[in-house]
Structure formats: C-alpha cells, structure tokens
Amino acid sequence: SERCDDWGLDTMRQIQVFEDEPARIKCPLFEHFLKFNYSTAHSAGLTLIWYWTRQDRDLEEPINFRLPENRISKEKDVLWFRPTLLNDTGNYTCMLRNTTYCSKVAFPLEVVQKDSCFNSPMKLPVHKLYIEYGIQRITCPNVDGYFPSSVKPTITWYMGCYKIQNFNNVIPEGMNLSFLIALISNNGNYTCVVTYPENGRTFHLTRTLTVKVVGSPKNAVPPVIHSPNDHVVYEKEPGEELLIPCTVYFSFLMDSRNEVWWTIDGKKPDDITIDVTINESISHSRTEDETRTQILSIKKVTSEDLKRSYVCHARSAKGEVAKAAKVKQKVPAPRYTVELACGFGAT
C-alpha cells in the first residue's frame, strides 16, 4: 500500500474508560494532528477507517462493527462502545485516506474495572476548591454527547462510597455539586453516576474526581522569608562550614510558579568560582501552602567568603522579596599571655 503519514502511538491520550459503560472516543487526528475537521475531510472524499491491536498482541485487526446490539459502532469521527468490555483494551488506530492521501494515528485505550465503591486504577482528575470562599461547584465531567437533550438522565452523587444525602455543606444539583463553604473535611473522591435509558437498555456513566481544598486567594500574601532574618548572625572562622538556610512561605496560588534562589555578591551561585552547594526541600500544608527551604553550603569558608553578600530571593505571582543573611568572621579570642602583656604596657 502507498505511504501513510503515521503519527505513531499518541501516548499523551492515554484513554481510560470503565468496564460495562458506554464510551465515545473521538479520532485524535482532527483534534491534535490535522488542520481540518472531520466534516471537511468527509466532504473532500476522505474515508475514516478504524482498526485495533489487542492487548499483548502485535496483529492489527479490523474492528468488528457487526456485534450484537451494535456494541461497537462508528459515527462520524467517533468510535462508540455501548458498552465497553474488559477485553476491548488495546491500541486503536484511526486512518483517514483516499487514493492520494493517508494519515493515521494510534492511541491506547484501557478498560478499567471498578468496585462497588468506585475504587479503581483510573487516574483521577483533581479539582481544587478554595477554602471558605463561598459557593463553588464541580460539574460531572465528560458526559456530553452520550444522550440527546430529550433524555432526562438521573444523576446521583457520592462522596467515597456514600450517596450525598443531606450533607452539611454539599448539595447535589443535577450535573453540578455545590459546596456552600469548602472545608478541609470536604477533601476526598466524589463520583457522579449518570443513569440514562437507550433502546430499552439502561446505561451508567461513572465519573470520579478528587476534590482538594486549597488556600483561598483572599488570604494569599507575597512570599514570606522566615530565614535568613535579622535575629540570626552566621559567625564563622575560616575553614569552618557555612550553612545558611533560606526558608520561604508561599500562599497557595492557582497556577503560580514559586521560586527561591540565592545570590552571592549579586550573582547566581553558578556564575561564581567558589565551591558552593544548594539543597532544596519542599513541604506543603493541608491547604497546599508551600514552604521551600534552600540551604546554601560552603564546606570550607574563607575569610573572603565571609565578606560576601548572601541574599535569599523569592518570587510568586503575588510578588518578589529578598533578604540578606548576616554573615561575619568570628573574631578569634585573644591569647591570655598577649592580653596580659598588653595590659601591663609591655612592648
């Protein structure tokens, strides 16, 4: 057969679906690889062909679209499972072609089992809610296109294993779940189960997401440098190890990049010749506020090093701050005999 533009296996689209539930999977060609959509391709005389490779097999085979009750079907650029089975797991390929053009891409599909409390190996999306921020909502994700607007599904929300029924501050409102005032106790996995009829059968769509309650932007502040500070002086003799911690608190800020760095005499440590190492550790509070510590270390400090300026810098979306460490050379204790001699006016 003639050459085909092969985009390979698109592992960025690791699609996971629950066993025994409907799944609609769009051909990734039109979403990520080609500059035109399915309608344009179709009207230009291009045909979309689907095939697959079963898990642990190398053989590409056509998809059987003649299964009982049309369990697997294709509609435009969507591959439908009504419903999925465990052994549908594999790599699926969609190929767009005519006599002069060919383009294809493969993607992995994993059919995942869940237990009756919705536990499964499914990778869960995380939805962050601001603590004590007023009403916030989560929406049952990825359910569009499964049933027509004339069908009124039943939506049941769960926290963990349990139906959300008169929870204090959590209210199911159809496809939405409203949190009146989000608290740390609202952290957990939330599942919506959408039940709808189709052709005399009942189908479920199960969608689980993790809710994480995080610091509110109302309470966010610029970075706070706890160390170095004015109360601690790093007094060293030449040859000793100099250790200066830079400890910075960052309020949680959605999509903010938190940065901490040292400068020595106004330069980054990499840009100067002294033998300096920097070790970083990060810890988080329950609301994802962040504390970063960078320890600047000089194994054998020289008297020159003790004259330098050591400044800790920190930056977040809320602003930038800096603080210099107080570093000085320890004055050696005078020898007793010399002191006495000086005291008696000896020359």
Epitope: E19, D20, P83, D115, S116, C117, F118, T154, T156, Y158, C161, Y162, K163, Q165, N166, V193, T195, R201, T202, H204
Partner: antibody
C-alpha cells in the same frame, strides 16, 4: 434501633383510593431514600416506587405509574403511598424499605408490612 | 425494564448440603445485585449486597459471586433456619426489579 412501621391497609373496592403510611424511627429519616415494595398473596416481591431523601426524585413501576403517588414528610419522619384507581391485582402486603446510601442501594431495613385487599 | 430470572424456582435439599441459586439479568448490571431471604409471614432480610459483600450479622456460610449478567448465591452448609425463599434484586436501573424467587425446602 431502626424501625419502619406501615399502616393504612385494609379492604377497598376496585376504583377506590387508599393512603398508606410508613413511620420511621431510630435513624435520620431525611438522609435516606425509601421504597415501597409489595407482595401479592403467595407470589414474589414486586418493587412499587422510590422517593429520594429530599423528595427531589420519584420513580414508579410501570404497573402503578399514573395511579400511585409516593411522598414524604421529613419533619414527621413519615413516608406515604397514595393509591388511586385501585385494581384487584393491587391486592398485596405493602412493605416500606430503607435504601442504604451506597451505590448498589440494598434495602437494609424493612417494615413488617400492611395488607391491602382490593375486592368488590 | 431489566428482567431478573432466578433458577431454580424451587429446590429441595438436606441440612449440611451445599446449594447454589443463580440469577440472570436481561442486560449487564455490573455488580448492582443484592440477595434477600424471606421466611413465611415475615419481611425480607438483606443477605448480600453488591453481588458479593456480606451484610453485617449474616452467617459466613452465605456467599455471593458474579458480575454483569450472571450471579450466584451459595450456601456452603445448609442449616435448618436457612429453609426460606430467596430473591435477587437489581439496583442498576432507577426502576428496580426482583427475581421471581427460589423456594428452598427440606428434602
């Protein structure tokens, strides 16, 4: 302990109405969905209707749709079944049952039942 | 509606026997399957929920298995108090349905 007590059964003529009640105690009634299930003499169990914890959703078996109405009064911890246009085939023991609040929704507690006889 | 079919309809067995009752759904119901025991003149009692989870207080000789369309209730060693009628029930659909029941009698 959890208790469900049905009342309101009796003998009624075809075409007439009857209202059953189910009084709940020993648990937070407003936090649970409650069902009506019936059993004709010598026959199996037949699900009749369910009402969600807050009354927001109600579902019925095809055999009673349009004739029976399920309702609840959470302030009184009571469930109701209004049965209109009764038929001879509605003769049965009617049970109310609490649905445990987990996905597979088993009925973990049942009342003792109340007998409804539809006869001319 | 989802139809639930139990088999057998009735079963004669002796104390100490191992018995199995099967339940088949007209479509896949995942593990949304519960089993109940009912004795004459009494309300049903929950035995197994979610196809295989044993309800608190139910003896461990009762067990459930299966998923999708085929389910089994097994009693490993029949006791005199186990002679009763058993029902399966699906809660996958908003319109719940029961199997027609299996009557377990003493041989």
């Amino acid at each position: 302990q959890v208790q469900l007590v049905e009342s309101g059964g009796g003998v009624v003529q075809p075409g007439r109405s009857l209202r059953l009640s189910c009084a709940a105690s020993g648990f937070t009634f407003r936090n649970y969905g409650i069902h009506w299930v019936r059993q004709a003499p010598g026959k199996g169990l037949e699900w009749v209707a369910v009402i969600w914890y807050d009354g927001s959703n109600k579902f019925y078996a095809d055999s009673v749709k349009g004739r029976f109405t399920i309702s609840r009064d959470n302030s009184k911890n009571t469930l109701y079944l209004q049965m209109n246009s009764l038929r001879v085939e509605d003769t049965a023991v009617y049970y109310c049952a609490r649905e445990e609040g987990i996905a597979v929704a088993p009925f973990d507690y049942w009342g003792q039942g109340t007998l409804v006889t539809v006869s001319s | 509606d989802i139809q639930m079919t139990q088999s057998p309809s009735s079963l004669s067995a002796s104390v100490g026997d191992r018995v199995a009752i099967t339940c088949r759904a007209s479509q896949s119901i995942a593990s949304y399957l519960n089993w109940y025991q009912q004795k004459p003149g009494k309300a049903p009692k929950l035995l197994i929920y979610g196809a295989s989870s044993l309800q608190n207080g139910v003896p461990s000789r009762f067990s459930g298995s299966g998923s999708r369309t085929d389910f089994t209730l097994t009693i490993s060693s029949l006791q005199p108090e186990d002679f009763a009628t058993y029902y399966c029930q699906q809660s996958y659909s908003t319109e719940i349905t029961f199997g027609q029941g299996t009557r377990l009698e003493i041989k």
